[in-house]
Structures are given as C-alpha cells and as structure tokens.
C-alpha cells in the first residue's frame, strides 16, 4: 500500500480468484483513543472499533472511503483504491490503446517546436467518475523539472456504438534550450482513477522525436504569364523555432485533383516557393518537416487551383 | 526522404554541402545498423545516450545562434579554447566565436573518426562479419574535416590487446551512431545558419 495523495491510498493486488489479498491497517487521524467506530462509504454498518482498523483487501467491494467517527462526528477519512496486477502486468482498463505509432501506445505526445513545450493526449470510453493527474520530468534518476497543467477533456467523438473522450495536457520544460542535444528523455506519468480503480501510464521520449510543425502559413498562388504553371509561395509557421536559418524546414508540395484516384504530383524543396502545374479543379497543398531530423510532417495547408 | 529534393546551391560556404552529405551518410549508416542488428538493443529507446565529446568540446554552446544567446538555458558555458584558422572561413569576416564554433566541430569529427576507425578494426575481426562501417561515411567525415582545415594534433588510433567482445562492440556502435547523428544534425543547422548570415 502507498499514499497517492493526502488520505488517498493505493492497494496493489495480484488479481486472481481466491487470492489472499492484502492486509491493510488504517489509523484514525485523531488524538482520541476511545469510542471510535469505522464505516465504509455511505453505509452505516460499523466495521470495527478502536483507533486502528485491520482489513483484508481482496476486491473492489473492500475498497472505498473508510471513515472513523466518534459520537456522530467524523474524525478522518482514508480512501482506498485498487491497482490490479493481471498475470504480472498492471491493468490498462481505463485508457484506450491508440496503436500508433506502435501497439501499447496509451499516451501520445507532440511538440510544435524545440521550446520544451509539448502536448500529450489520451483516449477513453469512460465518461464519469474519472480523474487524471500528470507529472513529468527530464530523466528519471536525477530528474529535471517539467511543469504540466491540468488534464482537460479536449474532444468527444462517436466511434460506432461508443463515445470516445480525448483528454489532453500541456507541459513545459522549466529550463529548455531549443538548440540543446537531448541525452535524457522526457518522462510523462499519468495517474488515472476511475471510481475505485487506480492505473498509471507512462511515456518516454525526446522532444526531437515528437516534433510536428504547424502547417506552413500564408499559402499563395501567383499565375505565371502565358503558362499553366503557378508559383506557390508560403511562410514558416509562427510557432516554429527561430532563427529559421538554424531551425530549417523542408517542404512537400502536392497537386491533387478533385478525385482521390487522380495521380498526385509531389515536389520536395527547402525553399518557401515552388513552381507547379495547376490543373483545373485541383488543389495545391504544402506541408513541412524539420529539414535535418525526420520527425513528423505537419498537416497540409491547402489552396484551390482556381 | 528518398524522394527528389530541390536543394539550394551551397554557394559561398563550402562546408554546407559537406555537412549535408555527412548527415545523409550517418543517417543511412544508422538505419543499416538498426536493420542488421535487429536482435541487439539498437533503437533510440533501448540505448544509453552517451556523448563522447562531452566535456571535451562545446559545439552546441560555441555554435549557438546569436538569437539564442539571450536564452539563459542555452548559456551553460564551458571553458574551452581552440586553434582558430580554417578554410570554411574563407573570404568572410568572422568573429572569434565563429572560429571557436568551427574548430569545435572539427574536434568532434576527429574524435568520432578515431572511434569509428577503432571500432571498424574490431568489427573486421568478427567471424560473423555481420556489420562494418560504411566507407562512404568515413570518407565524408574526412572531407568535412579537410574543408574545415584546422591544424590539430593527430589523435593516435586506439589499439586494444584483449580479445574484442563483439556483442559489446556492436552495442557501442549503435550508441556512437545515434550520438553522431544528433551531432551531425547540430552541425548541419550551424552550417545552414552560417551560410545564411
């Protein structure tokens, strides 16, 4: 058993039928010695008396809010949560496996630049009685500070018969140098509590590997005289690290016809303009990627050819 | 990106072209190592990230763009001094910091060159003959060093009398390649920045 936060405790259980469970001793936080009784949740049934209560925790029915009273007055509470170990592996019932970029990806994180600021998100089908707490650090043995905000519900989607809820959190490394070469990964730890079930999820990454620039901005077309060609121009996104001559991007320019089946013409360039043939009803799209370290491409910025 | 790329002419700054070749070569070598050594811990998640130049050179600090010198977190200054002449500085007014930066890059390349050559000698003794260093990568390191053209004491190639542990050597190769790729990215950024200045 260990303390998650004040008056909230996590009991780790090897989850199998007829398991002996864990013996837990609760102590009432009071100077009183006599006349103390214990109850669980909203029940008025007295579970025991005295300053301590010894219980055998085997299943969810044994978890919950234990309260010690004296003469009708509440003295203190202890909330017991369960963390299930299923055949040697901690349960992952609360969050959905996003399966991207690989199986067992419960937390996904992205950064728009090298400032040390990043966003992580996760998915669940659970809509109520759900709380998250996020901690982060650079490295684990001698951790350096990363500050995370509160996790918030950022999107709701309908997936088949189920509703899916997306939660996200923003974190910022306390003293980040955009030009630094990372040798210790960022560690992100999410504590998830659903009713009386506790689970924890972790992700470890280098900022350089989770970079995804915003799409190029100010995408414009300039027709060239007496030609089907147009000059496409764009700018670096505002959120990208500066100076741009140091943090350079490379770009992919795509001409896409109205039909998805039509052949796509693609050009790659390090410049912020390109000359392409604009077909009728086609659209021109541009996306960006770090020029020197191939992490993710940005989403496309698009304009119609007409 | 194995697709056609319209790259700008390196123009006045001869080192930019070499640094781009260097990054391409080390990235290819790392990819080859990850594929060939698939049963070894060779991915970014699995290896220990070590920097053989730590406390010996200060490339990141010495080559910091002016715009980032206001960032306190970037000014983790380390006392270092380097010889300051080099042909990449040709026909350019350069500050002491720029010379320091380029000589730091030269020292990095020299240290990696020695490590890679020592390692290759060991890998050539492996009866499995599983992996060797790409001669192109070693040649590109050499070309960039020549372009930088700093006078520097030659570092003798390390020789080892004991029987090499090929498993450890291959893991060390992965560690070195990951670190060198990160340094090659920094070098490319620096050359691009200097070229634009």
């Amino acid at each position: 058993i260990w303390e998650l936060k004040k008056d909230v405790y996590v009991v780790e259980l090897d989850w199998y039928p007829d398991a002996p469970g864990e013996m837990v001793v609760l102590t009432c936080d009071t100077p009183e010695e006599d006349g103390i009784t214990w109850t669980l949740d909203q029940s008025s049934e007295v579970l025991g008396s005295g300053k301590t209560l010894t219980i055998q925790v085997k299943e969810f029915g044994d978890a919950g809010q234990y309260t010690c009273h004296k003469g009708g007055e509440v003295l203190s509470h202890s909330l017991l949560l369960l963390h299930k170990k299923e055949d040697g592996i901690w349960s992952t019932d609360i969050l959905k496996d996003q399966k991207e970029p690989k199986n067992k990806t419960f937390l996904r994180c992205e950064a728009k630049n090298y400032s040390g600021r990043f966003t992580c998100w996760w998915l669940t089908t659970i809509s109520t009685d759900l709380t998250f707490s996020v901690k982060s650090s650079r490295g684990s043995s001698d951790p350096q500070g990363v500050t995370c905000g509160a996790a918030t519900l950022s999107a709701e989607r309908v997936r088949g018969d189920n509703k899916e809820y997306e939660y996200s959190v923003e974190c910022q490394e306390d003293s980040a140098c955009p030009a630094a070469e990372e040798s210790l990964p960022i560690e992100v730890m999410v504590d998830a509590v659903h009713k009386l079930k506790y689970e924890n999820y972790t992700s470890s990454f280098f900022i350089r590997d989770i970079i995804k620039p915003d799409p190029p901005k100010n995408l414009q077309l300039k027709p060239l005289k007496n030609s089907r060609q147009v000059e496409v121009s764009w700018e670096y996104p505002d959120t990208w690290s500066t100076p741009h001559s140091y943090f350079s991007l490379t770009f992919c320019v795509q001409v896409q016809g109205k039909s998805k089946r039509e052949k796509k013409d693609r050009v790659f360039t390090d410049k912020t303009s390109a000359t392409v043939i604009c077909r009728k009803n086609a659209s021109i799209s541009v996306r960006a990627q770090d020029r020197y370290y191939s992490s993710s491409w940005s989403e496309w910025a698009s304009v119609p050819c007409s | 990106r194995n697709l056609p790329v319209a790259t700008p002419d390196p123009g006045m700054f001869p080192c930019l072209h070499h640094s781009q070749n260097l990054l391409r070569a080390v990235s290819n070598m790392l990819q080859k190592a990850r594929q060939t050594l698939e049963f070894y811990p060779c991915t970014s998640e699995e290896i220990d990230h070590e920097d053989i130049t730590k406390d010996k050179t200060s490339t990141v600090e010495a080559c910091l763009p002016l715009e980032l010198t206001k960032n306190e977190s970037c000014l983790n200054s380390r006392e270092t001094s380097f010889i300051t002449n080099g042909s990449c500085l040709a026909s350019r007014k350069t500050s002491f910091m720029m010379a320091l930066c380029l000589s730091s890059i030269y020292e990095d390349l020299k240290m990696y060159q020695v490590e890679f050559k020592t390692m290759n000698a060991k890998l050539l003794m492996d009866p499995k003959r599983q992996i060797f260093l790409d001669q192109n990568m070693l040649a590109v390191i050499d070309e960039l060093m020549q372009a930088l053209n700093f006078n520097s004491e030659t570092v003798p190639q390390k020789s080892s009398l004991e029987e090499p542990d090929f498993y450890k050597t291959k893991i060390k190769l992965c560690i070195l390649l990951h670190a060198f790729r990160i340094r090659a990215v920094t070098i490319d950024r620096v050359m691009s920045y200097l070229n634009a200045s």
Epitope: E59, G88, I89, D93 | -
Partner: antibody, heavy 115, light 112 residues
Framework: QVQLVESGGGVVQPGRSLRLSCAAS????????MHWVRQAPGKGLEWVAF????????YYADSVKGRFTISRDNSKNTLYLQMNSLRAEDTAVYYC????????WGQGTMVTVSS | QSVLTQPPSVSGAPGQRVTISCSGS????????VKWYQQLPGTAPKLLIY???QRPSGVPDRFSGSKSGTSASLAITGLQAEDEADYYC????????????FGTGTKVTVLA
Amino acid sequence: QVQLVESGGGVVQPGRSLRLSCAASGFTFSSYGMHWVRQAPGKGLEWVAFIRYDGSNKYYADSVKGRFTISRDNSKNTLYLQMNSLRAEDTAVYYCKTHTSHDNWGQGTMVTVSS
Amino acid sequence: QSVLTQPPSVSGAPGQRVTISCSGSRSNIGSNTVKWYQQLPGTAPKLLIYYNDQRPSGVPDRFSGSKSGTSASLAITGLQAEDEADYYCQSYDRYTHPALLFGTGTKVTVLA
C-alpha cells in the same frame, strides 16, 4: 472451488461453423479476462483469443482473425468462441483459461474439422 | 510459429536433475514474466511456476524456475517417474500483450 467446463466441440465439415462454451463457477467471472487456447493433436499449445473482463476489448491470433469471435455473458458466467469458416487446421482440443497469475484451465473440448 | 524456443526433448534417470531452457527476445521474456506448465497425456496444462520463479501451493519444491535476460529455465531435481510429461514455457510480448506466447514444448523422459 474455481471450475471451468468447456462444451460444444464435435466433428464438423470444412467451411461450417461451431460455437464453443465455457461455463465458469466458483469465482467472480465478471472480474477476470479470459483466453481460449488450442492444441492440435500431437502439437504444442497455441493461443487463440482473449476478452477483457467486461467484454470491451477482444484480441485474436492472426490464424483465426476474421473467422472466430470471442464473447462473454457475465450474467450467465459463460465464455463463448464462435468459429466460422472452419478449416482442417483448426482441428484441436480447445481450452478456456483465466487471465491471471494463478491460472485455471478447463478440461478442454475436441473440435474435429474433416470432410 | 512460436517465438519462445525450447529443446524438443530432455531425459534423465530417476533422482537426476534436468533443466529445460526457454529462449526469447527483449520484447517478450526480456520485458515480461515467465510461466511454466506441465502437461500429462490427455490432460489440460497444469501451472508449475509463475512470475519466473514462484511455485503455486501444491507444486513440489523439486520444480524451480529462473529467468535471466531474454531466457528462462525450469529445473527438476530428484527426477521421478511421474514427471514424464510435456513442459511449456509461456510469456507475453510487450507489443502484442495480452496474446499468450507459448514455448515450442519439451518432452521430458524418465529413463528406466
């Protein structure tokens, strides 16, 4: 006393279907994930499918994906394996088993796919 | 095909010590715990070892398990006639969990 009893096996022609059941007793069935494992005659053990305690997630071996469906009815304390488009290579003893460290297995039910 | 490799057979005289190896990789045995099962002819597998080296109650202490890196082993000391059976190791892969990974199986023969 934890008990798992499989049923529904038999002889079936290739391309036909069969539904196996696994009746659980002596424990809180709805609290545990469950597996189906099979063993072809004279061969080793092969994992077939898994279902979460609440039925929310299902996983399958590549060899049965798209043909077999695992399901459970927690009100009946029963695990099921719906087997469609059966092939000769599906011939095996099928076991159900709890997803726990101290696991419990059923006695198995024989499925023979033969023309 | 199984990704956990076991020797097809091992044998020993009564009273002897035999060991069965189970070889995997970093993503399975290297990252997860190992179980061992005994299967007598015509019966369901019986759990011998869980969490690499733990014996459920009722399993004789002649059976012991261990794990090191990407491989595990089962040792049977004081071999007895009733130990003649098939033995399987089992683990998970960190990327395909909860799919069960079984070893190829080892036939233990007790020499007369």
